[in-house]
């Protein structure tokens, strides 16, 4: 279970792929679309509010003991909207929702080589946010394989201003 209901920390950052393409969010027909694209030099990167939560990680060796903590994150590019995993459609979508957020909005954070991170679905272990055909999608990764596959690697560039939502 997630410890407490408030995040341990928050940060405002832009999100890009391993290949330095930007993740952007556009309002179309009253719903948000998520794009993966090369940004024109003068275009500002979209900001995402990342809220980090700690969850107790149960120990399988010591029965009901606790090994440590799982670091989970929610991603919100604009007020009241959060990235969510749609496991049935293998898609990543932006949904308006109220707190408490559904489990589909939580992703286990992994840090990887090259100062990249990966986002694993809380609701579907082994499934990560990835890039497919210039969109974000859910990609199944075999744990025995190298999790460094580039399409699930993302870079976070923190924006040094107070962690308020932008509008």
């Amino acid at each position: 279970s997630i410890t407490g209901i408030s995040p341990i920390t928050e940060s405002l950052a832009s999100l890009s792929t391993y290949n330095d393409q930007s993740i952007t969010f556009a309002l179309e027909d009253e719903s948000y679309e998520i794009y993966v694209e090369d940004l024109k030099k003068d275009k500002k990167k979209d900001k995402v509010l990342l809220s980090y939560y700690e969850s107790q990680h149960p120990s399988s060796e010591s029965g009901d003991g606790v090994d440590g903590k799982m670091l989970m994150v929610t991603l919100s590019p604009t007020k009241d909207f959060w990235l969510q995993a749609n496991n049935k459609e293998h898609s990543v979508e932006l949904h308006k929702c109220e707190k408490p957020l559904p489990d589909q909005a939580f992703f286990v954070l992994h840090n990887r080589s090259f100062n990249c991170v990966s986002f694993e679905c809380k609701t579907d272990p082994g499934v990560f946010i990835g890039v497919k055909d210039n969109h974000l999608a859910l990609i199944k990764v075999d744990y025995s394989e190298n999790l460094g596959s580039e399409n699930i690697l993302f870079k976070l560039s923190e924006i040094l201003e107070h962690h308020h939502h932008h509008h």
Epitope: E54, S59, D67, K69, L71, S113
Partner: antibody, heavy 122, light 107 residues
Framework: EVQLVESGGGLVQPGGSLRLSCAAS????????MSWVRQAPGKGLEWVSS????????NYADSVKGRFTISRDNSKNTLFLEMNSLRAEDTAVYYC???????????????WGQGTLVTVSS | DIQMTQSPSSVSASVGDRVTITCRAS??????LAWYQQKPGKAPKLLIY???SLQSGVPSRFSGSGSGTYFTLTISSLQPEDFATYYC?????????FGGGTKVEIK
């Protein structure tokens, strides 16, 4: 109870090799990022290398890149550090450390071994 | 690489004193900072993670604060067992880096 026990340290000549091991118990070893941190005599702490739970992702300090290799055997709950082309400046106590966070080093290291001394000298 | 600068390098204090140690990062690290205590001949012990979260089993007289580039560790009332060396560590990006340490000595 979480335990990390390092072994494999000793005296080695410059240019030589050593393989350090860290035997882990008391936690789900394969779930955690593991790291090596070293401390030269009378000096501060220096991070050396980290490896993800499944071994698929590794990171190294520039000072050891190309000379040291981190690996793990999850079936034996053991972490390794293969050290080649050793230099006098590699002389230090080497600690094996478990990340507090399962899949990330963002939360620091909550358990450390007792350390094993590596001395590089002719 | 992110440089971590700790100050002071040493401090002399008495039991019951309030002690504050600062750590500056050469660039922003959000809240990804840990504090450790190390006693001679022993391994470091995690005190604080994510800048201000108290690690399980650590006495509440230890507290951490800060974000971005400036962080502090405070011991509200120094106890005999607190005389040790304290290190900050940025956990924001590789290579992970430690401050140079602050030795808390008996006055």
């Amino acid at each position: 109870e979480v335990q990390l026990v390092e072994s494999g340290g000793g005296l080695v000549q410059p240019g030589g090799s050593l393989r350090l091991s860290c035997a882990a118990s008391g936690f789900t070893f394969s779930s955690y990022v593991m790291s090596w941190v070293r401390q030269a005599p009378g000096k501060g702490l220096e991070w050396v290398s980290s490896i993800s739970g499944n071994g698929g992702s590794t990171n190294y300090a520039d000072s050891v890149k190309g000379r040291f290799t981190i690996s793990r055997d999850n079936s034996k709950n053991t972490l390794f550090l293969e050290m080649n082309s050793l230099r006098a400046e590699d002389t230090a106590v080497y600690y094996c450390a478990k990340s507090l966070g399962t899949t990330t080093t963002f939360l620091g290291f909550d358990y450390w071994g007792q350390g094993t001394l590596v001395t590089v000298s002719s | 690489d992110i440089q971590m600068t700790q100050s002071p390098s040493s401090v002399s204090a008495s039991v019951g004193d309030r002690v504050t140690i600062t750590c500056r990062a050469s660039q922003g690290i959000s809240s990804w900072l840990a504090w450790y205590q190390q006693k001679p001949g022993k391994a470091p012990k995690l005190l604080i993670y994510a800048a201000s979260s108290l690690q399980s089993g650590v006495p509440s007289r230890f507290s951490g604060s800060g974000s971005g580039t400036y962080f502090t560790l405070t011991i509200s009332s120094l106890q005999p067992e607190d005389f040790a060396t304290y290190y900050c560590q940025q956990a924001n990006s590789f290579p992970l880096t430690f401050g140079g340490g602050t030795k808390v000595e008996i006055k």
